[in-house]
Amino acid sequence: DTEIKVNPPQDFEIVDPGYLGYLYLQWQPPLSLDHFKECTVEYELKYRNIGSETWKTIITKNLHYKDGFDLNKGIEAKIHTLLPWQCTNGSEVQSSWAETTYWISPQGIPETKVQDMDCVYYNWQYLLCSWKPGIGVLLDTNYNLFYWYEGLDHALQCVDYIKADGQNIGCRFPYLEASDYKDFYICVNGSSENKPIRSSYFTFQLQNIVKPLPPVYLTFTRESSCEIKLKWSIPLGPIPARCFDYEIEIREDDTTLVTATVENETYTLKTTNETRQLCFVVRSKVNIYCSDDGIWSEWSDKQCWEGEDLSKKTLLR
């Protein structure tokens, strides 16, 4: 009885289509695969950024797989052929591993790359990224930002740079159609007549870096002798009400009374009849139902009541 063997895939490689970190892993079928024509051969693919402790593992019938990587580091991957037990009248047969690596040859020393890169998606509408020049780079150094997300044909360069002393230190992005809930890839590279500049790569999802506008139209309404309802409206813009969390800071007679986080545009406050002044501010943030992370908005304008009986008045700013 001949032992069944299968070859590893051929020409296993990592292909960089120029999408700033979104790479293709592809391979050719093993030789002599048509011996198993009635059988669906599968491939087990393992890959990771070099330095990561864990491999991502995929089992696929395809000859390619696509995923995002951190191009600041190298990538390693390995693959082997799997013949399911149905093909072999027994146990699963595996080929040996085929292995490959990929990395972008770094230019320049690490200190020359941009420092303190910070990107904020203002009100889920306007993306702005800013950075500081690398350490010790000369004024002739200029940085260029490129970006890509799935839906763009190719990486695009920033067309509206923020400048300081003639150097690009940030980018105002144009309207980014259908760009949230997917990986957004950025490369900031640089040029200098003096020395090579190290590129930096960044990946994030836009919904996770949203900084909303602050809430508006803060009001007080007396609900009962000892309760006041604080109300406000969602900020103007495209973010739906269901996506907000709010933080309220309430001061009674110059003493911080309450700091609370709520999901709705109201908060009911217990008060005493002796209250002479009541002020509150609110800020907003995208909640866990719409993102994995977010940035608190600025505080709203302060809304205050003072010097009159709260029971007799509804206050509207």
Partner: antibody, heavy 118, light 107 residues
Framework: QVQLVQSGAEVVKPGASVKLSCKAS????????MSWVRQAPGQGLEWVAT????????YYPESVKGRFTITRDNSTSTLYMEMRSLRSDDTAVYYC???????????WGQGTLVTVSS | DIVMTQSPLSLPTTLGQPASISCKAS??????VAWYQQRPGQSPRALIY???YRYSGVPDRFSGSGSGTDFTLTISRVEAEDVGVFYC?????????FGGGTKLEIK
């Protein structure tokens, strides 16, 4: 449909260099390996070079190794072969061909005649 | 290098009759053999891969068989458009090698 359109005929002197091109359409170029095969006048087919879909792997026979270089530009779906130190026995029609998933060649270009003559 | 030896060199055939071409490999190439047809003045055209599987669009009168070192291309009923040179090729190992060709002619 799959099409491979090659550059025009070349006449060069011995020792010179030339670069052939092959523009592909009708398929996802970066997913396929590509090959060059040549045919000297009145002779059979001789394999000259193969490159993998991403360009990471290249293969040559001893007869051209070090003189011929196969490259590809996936952004323009174009295959190239640069031939240096040409000799009279390199005179042939050069075909580009798509390598199918089993390393056979399923589609072929129309051929480019390269004549090496003093 | 693996040498692929084809026979016969020339194959005069009558229209409607069968024809067979043999290809022998100098070492085991499993089933990693392809067959091509080159009509006069044209580029080669792929017929068979993995020794016995027809490419899409290839008439079913063409069939391939064999494994290891002995391979055969058979045309069940020769038609006028079949004239040309037929080549076998192994892709079991680099360098890829072709047979010397078999010229099919109509008697």
């Amino acid at each position: 449909q799959v099409q491979l359109v090659q550059s025009g005929a070349e006449v060069v002197k011995p020792g010179a260099s030339v670069k052939l091109s092959c523009k592909a359409s009708g398929f996802t170029f970066s997913s396929y390996g590509m090959s060059w095969v040549r045919q000297a006048p009145g002779q059979g087919l001789e394999w000259v070079a193969t490159i993998s879909g991403g360009g990471s792997y290249t293969y040559y026979p001893e007869s051209v190794k070090g003189r011929f270089t196969i490259t590809r530009d996936n952004s323009t779906s174009t295959l190239y072969m640069e031939m240096r130190s040409l000799r009279s026995d390199d005179t042939a029609v050069y075909y580009c061909a798509r390598r199918d998933l089993r390393s056979a060649m399923d589609y072929w270009g129309q051929g480019t005649l390269v004549t090496v003559s003093s | 290098d693996i040498v692929m030896t084809q026979s016969p060199l020339s194959l005069p055939t009558t229209l409607g009759q069968p024809a067979s071409i043999s290809c022998k490999a100098s070492q085991n190439v499993d089933i990693n053999v392809a067959w091509y047809q080159q009509r006069p003045g044209q580029s080669p055209r792929a017929l068979i891969y993995s020794a016995s599987y027809r490419y899409s669009g290839v008439p079913d009168r063409f069939s391939g068989s064999g494994s290891g070192t002995d391979f055969t291309l058979t045309i069940s009923r020769v038609e006028a458009e079949d004239v040309g040179v037929f080549y076998c090729q192994q892709y079991n190992a680099y360098p890829l090698t072709f047979g010397g060709g078999t010229k099919l002619e109509i008697k």
